[in-house]
């Protein structure tokens, strides 16, 4: 008598998540009498997937009528496939008995599930950095299968090359995650810049997913300070200007000191934006020269975005009062990022 064969024609089947998977199985003979069962996996840990005789398998339906006389097709359809359904499925013939005895197994069909990656999430550094510094951006996407995936980084449309990407886990899995870290060198012009992480996968039909991050969240552009004196007014009042330019973010506090004593403190708010996304701010201080016997040392002190204060000092000469004082007569500088003013 011809030996019974259990034929699983497909070595592997690939299905998109949410779709149905058909697992084919035919037997070469009607004898011996006994049921067919479907298992995922082999050995003692295998899971029963379908047993016509008993059990409740709501997502599994036979492709042909298993109760029909002379039926030799025991293919099944599994609906609403998820990545957790991946594995090797075996069609197994049993000989009728008490209990039924396993007779022969098919060679197995490996079911792989194609699952889309989640929308990439890009996160930037926890603290801001200044121009010429390198900051790291991380892009993460999860839940995709198969493992093959392409990730690219762009800054303002230009592809970046300094990045490192890992796909986990390293071995076979029902689904995978990707994590990539890109290193970006900041420039003062990057307030309006954007980094984009682009993920391409077979499930996306050539339409990659993108995640973005604004460099405005990562950059600090420190201000330039300039202190100047306008011409002395007829009432012996000197108008001293502190120009704070090209800074980002807007969070800034300016303090005027007269001979080391706080004269006035101002907070920047609702400033107009420059084309490059930075801000400018100008503060004025009127000094009554006739109220002072000695020279007045004025200091414009700027605290930007929680950083150490930057000072610019300026001395107003009181000893001689020329009627027109169109230019600075003397200046002192302390602190960082300072220039002499003459």
């Amino acid at each position: 008598e011809e030996e019974l064969q259990v034929i699983q024609p497909e070595k592997s089947v690939s299905v998109a998540a949410g779709d149905s998977a058909t697992l084919n199985c035919t037997v070469s003979s009607l004898i011996p009498v006994g049921p067919i069962q479907w298992f995922r996996g082999a050995g003692p840990g295998r899971e029963l997937i379908y047993n016509l005789k008993e059990g409740h398998f709501p997502r599994v339906t036979p492709v042909s009528d298993p109760t029909k006389r002379n039926n030799m097709d025991f293919s099944i359809r599994i609906s609403n496939i998820t990545p957790a359904d991946a594995g090797t499925y075996y069609c197994v013939k049993f000989r009728k008995g008490s209990p039924d005895v396993e007779l022969k197994s098919g060679a197995g069909t490996e079911l792989s599930v194609r699952a889309k990656p989640s929308a990439p999430v890009v996160s930037g550094p926890a603290v801001r950095a200044t121009a010429e510094h390198t900051v790291s951006f991380t892009c993460e996407s999860h839940g995709f299968s198969p493992r093959d995936i392409t990730l690219k980084w762009f800054k303002n449309g230009n592809e970046l090359s300094d990045f490192q990407t890992n796909v986990d886990p390293a071995g076979k899995s029902v689904s995978y995650s990707i994590r990539s870290t890109a290193r970006v060198v900041l420039t003062r012009r990057d307030v309006h810049s954007q980094v984009i992480c682009e993920v391409a996968h077979v499930t996306l039909q050539g339409d990659p997913l993108r995640g973005t991050a604004n460099l405005s969240e990562a950059i600090r552009v420190p201000p330039f300070l300039e202190v100047t004196q306008q011409s002395m007014r007829a009432d012996n009042q000197v108008n001293v200007t502190c120009q704070v330019t090209k800074f980002y973010p807007q969070r800034l506090q300016l303090t005027w000191l007269e001979n080391g004593n706080v004269s006035r403190t101002e907070m920047a708010s609702a400033l107009p934006e420059n084309k490059d996304g930075t801000y400018n701010w100008t503060s004025w201080l009127l000094v009554n020269v006739s109220a002072h016997r000695d020279d007045v040392k004025l200091t414009c002190q700027v605290e930007h975005d929680g950083q150490p204060a930057v000072n610019k000092s300026f001395s107003v000469k009181v000893s001689a009062h020329p009627k027109e004082q169109g230019s600075n007569t003397a200046a002192e500088n302390t602190g960082t990022n300072e220039r002499n003013i003459y």
Partner: antibody, heavy 122, light 112 residues
């Protein structure tokens, strides 16, 4: 080429818990059983238990009450925990891969770690 | 549990000569699907065991053809057609039909 590497403390105090990890490199955890086997000094091999990639565990009945095997697919690792150890648990502990291709049984323990010596002593 | 019994305990051999090891199980390892769930392993001195034969008679990848497995049900034999010096070590049979998996006590093969 699949390789297995056991790691864990070489000395465990009596009544404490023995914890070992096996790292799988160069291959997949899927579709295999992952086994722990031990060999007391100068003696034969004793099967402790195994875990299938789907998380189902099987233990030697003589050790079942003290043993837990777990699997971390994301790290490509599986672990053994054995509680209330005594000097009789002193052995070389091997982790190994067991094949299963069809049917109810197993098709050979084809990859073994190099083994790690665990001594139970105070 | 299935009990595995190996004989002899020790086997002195001459290089180039054949050798044979017996393994008996307390119940049949022949399953209804036609497979005998019995493996043979060799543990060389200071090394981990290595798989030689699986499912009773199938040679594992990379195993020389001088090793062969035979038998069915409860009686199994491992034959080495021509012993070589590298074959010294302890040979174990193991049943893989049901848990707990159980090993024979081992047969120590040494050169005369």
């Amino acid at each position: 080429q699949v390789q297995l590497q056991e790691s864990g403390p070489g000395l465990v105090r009596p009544s404490e818990t023995l914890s070992l990890t096996c790292t799988v490199s160069g291959g997949s955890i899927r579709n295999y059983y992952w086994s722990w086997i031990r060999q007391p000094p100068g003696k034969g091999l004793e099967w402790i238990g195994f875990i299938y990639y789907n998380g189902r565990t099987f233990y030697n009945s003589s050790l079942k009450s003290r043993v837990t095997i777990s699997l971390d697919m994301s790290m490509n690792q599986f672990s053994l925990k054995m509680t209330s150890v005594t000097a009789a648990d002193t052995a070389v502990y091997y982790c190994a891969r067991v094949r299963a291709y069809s049917g109810i049984g197993l098709d050979g323990t084809d990859v073994w770690g190099q083994g790690t010596t665990v001594t139970v002593s105070s | 549990d299935i009990v595995m019994t190996q004989s002899p305990l020790s086997l002195p051999v001459t290089p180039g000569e054949p050798a044979s090891i017996s393994c008996k199980s307390s119940q049949s390892l022949l399953y209804s699907n036609g497979y005998n769930y019995l493996d043979w392993y060799l543990q060389r001195p200071g090394q981990s065991p290595q798989l030689l034969i699986y499912l009773g008679s199938n040679r594992a990848s990379g195993v020389p053809d001088r090793f062969s497995g035979s038998g069915s049900g409860t009686d199994f034999t491992l034959k080495i057609s021509r012993v070589e010096a590298e074959d010294v070590g302890v040979f174990y049979c193991m049943q893989a039909l049901q848990t707990p998996l159980t090993f024979g006590g081992g047969t120590k093969v040494e050169i005369k």
